[in-house]
């Protein structure tokens, strides 16, 4: 049994780091493998993660963490029984993938303005809470070419757009994702999408 693709890990900078790897053949990850992780810190203990299958030869492990600070560094040991398959290390602050924003809502009752709001996925005491920026994706269900991205570079989790920038009388969907420049993170996954029917009064044309 050998590791074909070494574990790569990302942290949500809160309580979970996710490590993925591939074996050289079909593997029952949860019965055959164990990923041991230990914070490089005085008097720390080793903790065990039981991996799950992620495709035939792929495995994924969700490492529970108390919280994350920039100094944290973990040793990782991948075991198959008594055999050490791989040894590595992981610094969560250098491999951050933020949590996806939630509760995306489209408010259509604001005089010809669409107000999109969503929730910051972090509690106020987490460092990332005040460092997230967002991308909002809006697309038409009827027209695949009608697809747009709005970058929200301010901290408030909301976006206002004129309803008239979208076509009237058709349905749109929106979703949002986050990233943090301070840790040069990857983008989060997209939030679940929300749907609304876009309608607005056409401006009265004067002749």
């Amino acid at each position: 049994m050998k590791v074909l693709q070494e574990p790569t890990c990302v942290s949500d900078y809160m309580s979970i780091s996710t490590c993925e790897w591939k074996m050289n053949g079909p593997t029952n990850c949860s019965t055959e493998l164990r990923l041991l992780y230990q914070l490089v810190f005085l008097l720390s203990e080793a903790h065990t993660c039981i991996p799950e299958n992620n495709g035939g030869a792929g495995c994924v492990c969700h490492l529970l963490m108390d919280d994350v600070v920039s100094a944290d560094n973990y040793t990782l040991d991948l075991w198959a029984g008594q055999q050490l398959l791989w040894k590595g290390s992981f610094k969560p602050s250098e491999h951050v993938k933020p949590r996806a924003p939630g509760n995306l809502t489209v408010h259509t009752n604001v005089s010809d303005t669409l107000l999109l709001t969503w929730s910051n996925p972090y509690p106020p005491d987490n460092y990332l809470y005040n460092h997230l920026t967002y991308a909002v994706n809006i697309w038409s269900e009827n027209d695949p070419a009608d697809f747009r991205i709005y970058n929200v570079t301010y901290l408030e989790p909301s976006l206002r757009i004129a309803a008239s920038t979208l076509k009237s009388g058709i349905s749109y969907r929106a979703r949002v994702r986050a990233w943090a420049q301070c840790y040069n993170t990857t983008w989060s996954e997209w939030s679940p999408s929300t749907k609304w029917h876009n309608s607005y009064r056409e401006p009265f044309e004067q002749h």
Epitope: L43, S44, E45
Partner: antibody, heavy 125, light 112 residues
Framework: EVQLVESGGGLEQPGGSLRLSCAGS????????MTWVRQAPGKGLEWVSS????????YYADSVKGRFTISRDNSKNTLYLQMNSLRAEDTAVYYC??????????????????WGQGTTVTVSS | DIVMTQSPLSLPVTPGEPASISCRSS???????????VDWYLQKSGQSPQLLIY???KRASGVPDRFSGSGSGTDFTLKISRVEAEDVGFYYC?????????FGQGTKLEIK
């Protein structure tokens, strides 16, 4: 009441051995790292050794490395310090102390918040 | 090894007056924001040491609020706002970020 009680001290000749014990009560012993600190007569405090809650992580002062062995029996809520090849400079009062909560991913530190009453080790011919 | 240097080594104080002890580490003992691994202990004559302050500024359970700790990185201070007769003894700072744990030389606080 959280309590630590040391025993096992005494008079020993240079080159001899002693085993100190520290019995813990009033807290979940296995969850916490434990530490030995000593104090030579008229001197300050000197750290000796520490052990994590499971016993999987151990540290020693250079002055005792290779001669002293720290261990624990969590089923008996007891910490030990096996002292071999004793020297005159090991003469001191030995204290055990409750250290950080080590079962968490990052050990939670609350200081050495409980100390035993101390046990005296005298090494002399 | 991290060296902990205390000053002064002797501190005569009048009851009711404030007192301050300094402790300097040869390397930073800051792990992350808010986590300075420096403690302060008091050892009264014939007794075991007792914890006063941990993580630089957190008062241990049961410790009177006249004791406070401050500082970050390499410079730390223990302050007693109004010294009482029962505060006499030896005060030690200690770092526990890295092995070996190291103590300061101790400061003897005595009543004038």
């Amino acid at each position: 009441e959280v309590q630590l009680v040391e025993s096992g001290g005494g008079l020993e000749q240079p080159g001899g051995s002693l085993r100190l014990s520290c019995a813990g009560s009033g807290f979940t012993f296995r969850d916490f790292a434990m530490t030995w600190v000593r104090q030579a007569p008229g001197k300050g405090l000197e750290w000796v050794s520490s052990i994590s809650g499971s016993g999987g992580n151990i540290y020693y002062a250079d002055s005792v490395k290779g001669r002293f062995t720290i261990s624990r029996d969590n089923s008996k809520n007891t910490l030990y310090l096996q002292m071999n090849s004793l020297r005159a400079e090991d003469t001191a009062v030995y204290y055990c102390a409750k250290d950080r909560l080590s079962k968490t991913i990052r050990p939670r530190y609350y200081g050495l918040d409980v100390w035993g009453q101390g046990t005296t080790v005298t090494v002399s011919s | 090894d991290i060296v902990m240097t205390q000053s002064p080594l002797s501190l005569p104080v009048t009851p009711g007056e404030p007192a301050s002890i300094s402790c300097r580490s040869s390397q930073s003992v800051l792990y992350s924001i808010g986590y300075n691994y420096v403690d302060w202990y008091l050892q009264k004559s014939g007794q075991s040491p007792q914890l006063l302050i941990y993580l630089g500024n957190k008062r241990a359970s049961g410790v009177p609020d006249r004791f406070s700790g401050s500082g970050s990185g390499t410079d730390f201070t223990l302050k007693i706002s109004r010294v009482e007769a029962e505060d006499v003894g030896f005060y030690y700072c200690m770092q526990s970020l890295t092995s070996p744990y190291t103590f300061g030389q101790g400061t003897k606080l005595e009543i004038k």
